[in-house]
């Protein structure tokens, strides 16, 4: 069971300092941006991180949403990352959800975050290069110290 708490506005970056944004095709991508680029591309660069209480002690449960024309929420259904047109719900009556991730602070690096899927244990949000694009994907952690699954989260409010 997950119960919604508060939300905060955040900019999410990978460890190469590329900014996460949602493109015109609703795809989550990373791109090099100056601070002014980041501001100019808002609200596509501003993510709503909603925190949830969890009936089990598993970590800080969150959803990641973006509000362009409508609110879309990040999902990892079938291990495929996409934004679904939906508001983060007030309650989720299940112990797993495709839209709930556990935000984890890497021990020894308070400012580095990982987002583990509640549906697929051991699978994390990651940045992966595909041709010329840097995509947000769901990835099984396969090597120790994998930088692709680490992010920084900068609160904007």
């Amino acid at each position: 069971y997950f119960g919604k708490l508060e939300s905060k506005l955040s900019v999410i970056r990978n460890l190469n300092d590329q900014v996460l944004f949602i493109d015109q095709g609703n795809r989550p991508l990373f791109e090099d941006m100056t601070d002014s680029d980041c501001r100019d591309n808002a609200p596509r660069t501003i993510f709503i991180i909603s925190m949830y209480k969890d009936s089990q002690p598993r970590g800080m449960a969150v959803t990641i949403s973006v509000k362009c024309e409508k609110i879309s929420t990040l999902s990892c259904e079938n291990k495929i990352i996409s934004f679904k047109e939906m508001n983060p719900p007030d309650n989720i009556k299940d112990t797993k959800s495709d839209i709930i991730f556990f935000q984890r602070s890497v021990p020894g690096h308070d400012n580095k975050m990982q987002f583990e899927s509640s549906s697929y244990e051991g699978y994390f949000l990651a940045c992966e290069k595909e041709r010329d694009l840097f995509k947000l994907i769901l990835k099984k952690e396969d090597e120790l110290g994998d930088r692709s699954i680490m992010f920084t989260v900068q609160n904007e409010d």
């Epitope: 984890r104 602070s105 021990p107 120790l144």
Partner: antibody, heavy 119, light 110 residues
Framework: EVQLVQSGAEVKKPGSSVKVSCKAS????????ISWVRQAPGQGLEWMGN????????YYAQKFQGRVTITADESTSTAYMELSSLRSEDTAVYYC????????????WGQGTLVTVSS | QSVLTQPPSASGTPGQRVTISCSGS????????VNWYQQLPGTAPKLLIY???HRPSGVPDRFSGSKSGTSASLAISGLQSEDEADYYC???????????FGGGTKLTVL
């Protein structure tokens, strides 16, 4: 780097209560779990329970259920552990520990507070 | 009596490789991650290994963890005198809905 600073040593009578504090400085406090773990002289570690300050959710080990109360004050970044109906077997060093990665991964520990229960 | 079983003591000479075992059951290690802590004499425990085999920054790569079935182990290679300490394994136990520690292993560097 987060630092957890605990209150000083206490000597208590059997049947009384003790309240130990744990103040966090230099990092995020509210969204992570704070656990309390005790260690009797010459013995191993024993988890008592935890709190997620932001949600107020608490989880207690069955052994301590009804006797321990864990609270947190977000405004001062301080967590508290109160243990009641003290007996001599409760003589131990009590540690608070922060869990930022997972509620059960204690990545930062306080210095410990010795509680002695003696008549 | 601890839910997780560790040998009470272990020893080795400088430069040697030492392994400390931690045995549990399907209600804890078999279905959950294992963490390891080092407690130097007179100090608070310190996180050494988390999630079976991950090292926090600052922990030397001489320390490694592994898990197989309902058991886990901590390996220390190139043993040094400063490794003399108590080592504790920890996991989550579903049957007691509680986090559990092993009884601890006192490592002596001869």
């Amino acid at each position: 780097e987060v630092q957890l600073v605990q209150s000083g040593a206490e000597v208590k009578k059997p049947g009384s209560s003790v309240k130990v504090s744990c103040k966090a400085s230099g990092g995020t406090f509210n969204s992570y779990a704070i656990s309390w773990v005790r260690q009797a002289p010459g013995q191993g570690l024993e988890w008592m329970g935890n709190i997620i300050p932001m949600t107020g959710q608490t989880y207690y080990a069955q052994k301590f259920q009804g006797r321990v109360t864990i609270t947190a004050d977000e405004s001062t970044s301080t967590a508290y552990m109160e243990l009641s109906s003290l007996r001599s077997e409760d003589t131990a060093v009590y540690y608070c520990a922060r869990a930022a990665y997972h509620p059960l991964v204690f990545d930062n520990w306080g210095q410990g507070t010795l509680v002695t229960v003696s008549s | 009596q601890s839910v997780l079983t560790q040998p009470p003591s272990a020893s080795g000479t400088p430069g040697q490789r030492v392994t400390i075992s931690c045995s549990g059951s399907s209600s804890n290690i078999g279905n959950h991650y294992v963490n390891w802590y080092q407690q130097l004499p007179g100090t608070a425990p310190k996180l050494l290994i988390y999630r079976n085999n991950h090292r926090p920054s600052g922990v030397p790569d001489r320390f490694s963890g592994s898990k197989s079935g309902t058991s886990a182990s901590l390996a220390i290679s190139g043993l040094q005198s400063e490794d003399e300490a108590d080592y504790y394994c920890q996991s989550w136990d579903y049957s007691g809905f509680s986090t559990v520690f092993g009884g601890g292993t006192k490592l002596t560097v001869l």
